[in-house]
């Protein structure tokens, strides 16, 4: 946004933020036995020109950033999204009240980038 | 921006938008011989609850959406980002004025999703 370019306040660049998710907070405590929660993390921050190496930007994101500079009303900046995700193992009750241990993919953000 | 969150109007869901990028518009016409431009496309739109199947959401995005509903000031919605990218071949001059044909990865958005 114009304020991103002009503002004296620096917007933080795209990065990983820590976030602990409690399954009780999500209302899942009745079917998830363990863990009680997990470090999910999340991605947030600006993908502004110039995109540096820390931002793990794709070629498309670099092109989109340049187009956005010229046409901000029409084309958004690339967004800050996970680039590496990890699985977690969850012990839970299935619909028949059986206890199941299952690995859920793409649950934990390990790294973020501009996409 | 705040208007994205506060608005009562319905925002369009995360999807692929068409975008043709001219290399002349980017100021790259002096080193890129061909093509003159390409259909880069981009991703834009809301990743709002509930995330349906079309949104190619990861497990983490589903969790983040629920956390956002409870804590919108602290945790953003997942963002709409490319899930499938294609390469394009580019004919260009290198620093020594040699003509090079090179395949550039991740240049074209083929599909978008909530991440």
């Amino acid at each position: 946004s114009a304020s991103d370019y002009n503002s004296s306040e620096l917007k933080t660049a795209c990065r990983k933020h820590e976030l602990y998710v409690s399954f009780q907070d999500l209302g899942w405590q009745d079917w998830i036995i363990a863990p009680k929660g997990y470090a999910a993390n999340y991605c947030d921050g600006e993908c502004s020109f110039p995109l540096n190496a820390h931002m793990n930007a794709t070629n498309h994101a670099i092109v989109q950033t340049l187009v956005h500079l010229m046409n901000p009303e029409y084309v958004p900046k690339p967004c800050c999204a996970p680039t590496k995700l990890n699985a977690i193992s969850v012990l839970y009750f299935d619909d028949n009240s059986n206890v199941i241990l299952k690995k859920y993919r793409n649950m934990v953000v390990r790294a973020c980038g501009c996409h | 921006s705040a208007s994205d969150y506060n608005s009562s109007e319905l925002k369009t869901a995360c999807r692929k938008h068409e975008l043709y990028v001219s290399f002349q518009d980017l100021g790259w016409q002096d080193w890129i011989i061909a093509p003159k431009g390409y259909a880069a496309n981009y991703c834009d739109g809301e990743c709002s609850f509930p995330l349906n199947a079309h949104m190619n959401a990861t497990n983490h995005a589903i969790v983040q959406t629920l956390v956002h509903l409870m804590n919108p000031e602290y945790v953003p919605k997942p963002c709409c980002a490319p899930t499938k990218l294609n390469a394009i071949s580019v004919l260009y001059f290198d620093d020594n004025s040699n003509v090079i044909l090179k395949k550039y990865r991740n240049m074209v958005v083929r599909a978008c999703g909530c991440h």
Epitope: A2, L69, M70, N71, P72, E73, Y74 | S3, E9, D25
Partner: antibody, heavy 118, light 107 residues
Framework: QVQFVQSGAEVKKPGASVKVSCKAS????????MHWVRQAPGQRLEWMGW????????DYSQNFQGRVTITRDTYANTVYMELSSLRSEDTAVYYC???????????WGQGTLVTVSS | DIQMTQSPSTLSASVGDRVTITCRAS??????LAWYQQKPGKAPKLLIY???SLESGVPSRFSGSGSGTEFTLTISSLQPDDFATYYC?????????FGQGTKVEIK
């Protein structure tokens, strides 16, 4: 033909707000972004902000951040610019202008004079 | 922000004169420059875009040139209708910025 008709002149007291409208006709309203530009007496043109008429996204010049709000009504093909906490320096002619993708401002409204005076 | 500086601020000329107005950008804007004409009490009117492309319906006596940081607007033979203020504007890098204007008045 493409045309923009703006609301009439306004006189406001310092600290008040003003809302100027700009009705578009002659093209598909949601296909272009609309901008607001102002011109104080004897001054250069000053860009204020834009709205994407299709999705309602907005952005504003840092000079007006927190004081300006741009909205649109797609049913009425109208864009609005509201400026709050008015001061005497906001006395100016306010223009709406269309900007096509990759281009400059190709069509302008006739302008709305806003006078801020106690 | 990119600063746009026009010269001269005022220009006195006669009908039939060749008139040149200069616009400088504080950094390179490639060819992303527009020229507008504004008459008192009226909205600006687009004359030139992409530094040298003539807007539809604009007389051919108007021409633009330049790229990078230096641009010129030329009126080959000044007509009575051309006495006005002219503004340059860059649209290469957001936010868009205008020059301070050049007033072309009758000598």
């Amino acid at each position: 033909q493409v045309q923009f008709v703006q609301s009439g002149a306004e006189v406001k007291k310092p600290g008040a707000s003003v809302k100027v409208s700009c009705k578009a006709s002659g093209y598909t309203f949601t296909s272009h972004a609309m901008h607001w530009v102002r011109q104080a007496p004897g001054q250069r043109l000053e860009w204020m902000g834009w709205i994407n008429a299709a999705n309602g996204k907005t952005d504003y010049s840092q000079n007006f951040q927190g004081r300006v709000t741009i909205t649109r009504d797609t049913y009425a093909n109208t864009v609005y610019m509201e400026l709050s906490s008015l001061r005497s320096e906001d006395t100016a002619v306010y223009y709406c202008a269309r900007r096509p993708y990759g281009g400059p401002f190709d069509y302008w409204g006739q302008g709305t004079l806003v006078t801020v005076s106690s | 922000d990119i600063q746009m500086t026009q010269s001269p601020s005022t220009l006195s000329a006669s009908v039939g004169d060749r008139v040149t107005i200069t616009c400088r950008a504080s950094q390179s804007i490639s060819i992303w420059l527009a020229w507008y004409q504004q008459k008192p009490g009226k909205a600006p009117k687009l004359l030139i875009y992409k530094a040298s492309s003539l807007e539809s319906g604009v007389p051919s006596r108007f021409s633009g040139s330049g790229s990078g940081t230096e641009f010129t607007l030329t009126i080959s033979s000044l007509q009575p209708d051309d006495f006005a203020t002219y503004y340059c504007q860059q649209y290469n890098l957001y936010p868009w910025t205008f020059g301070q204007g050049t007033k072309v008045e009758i000598k």
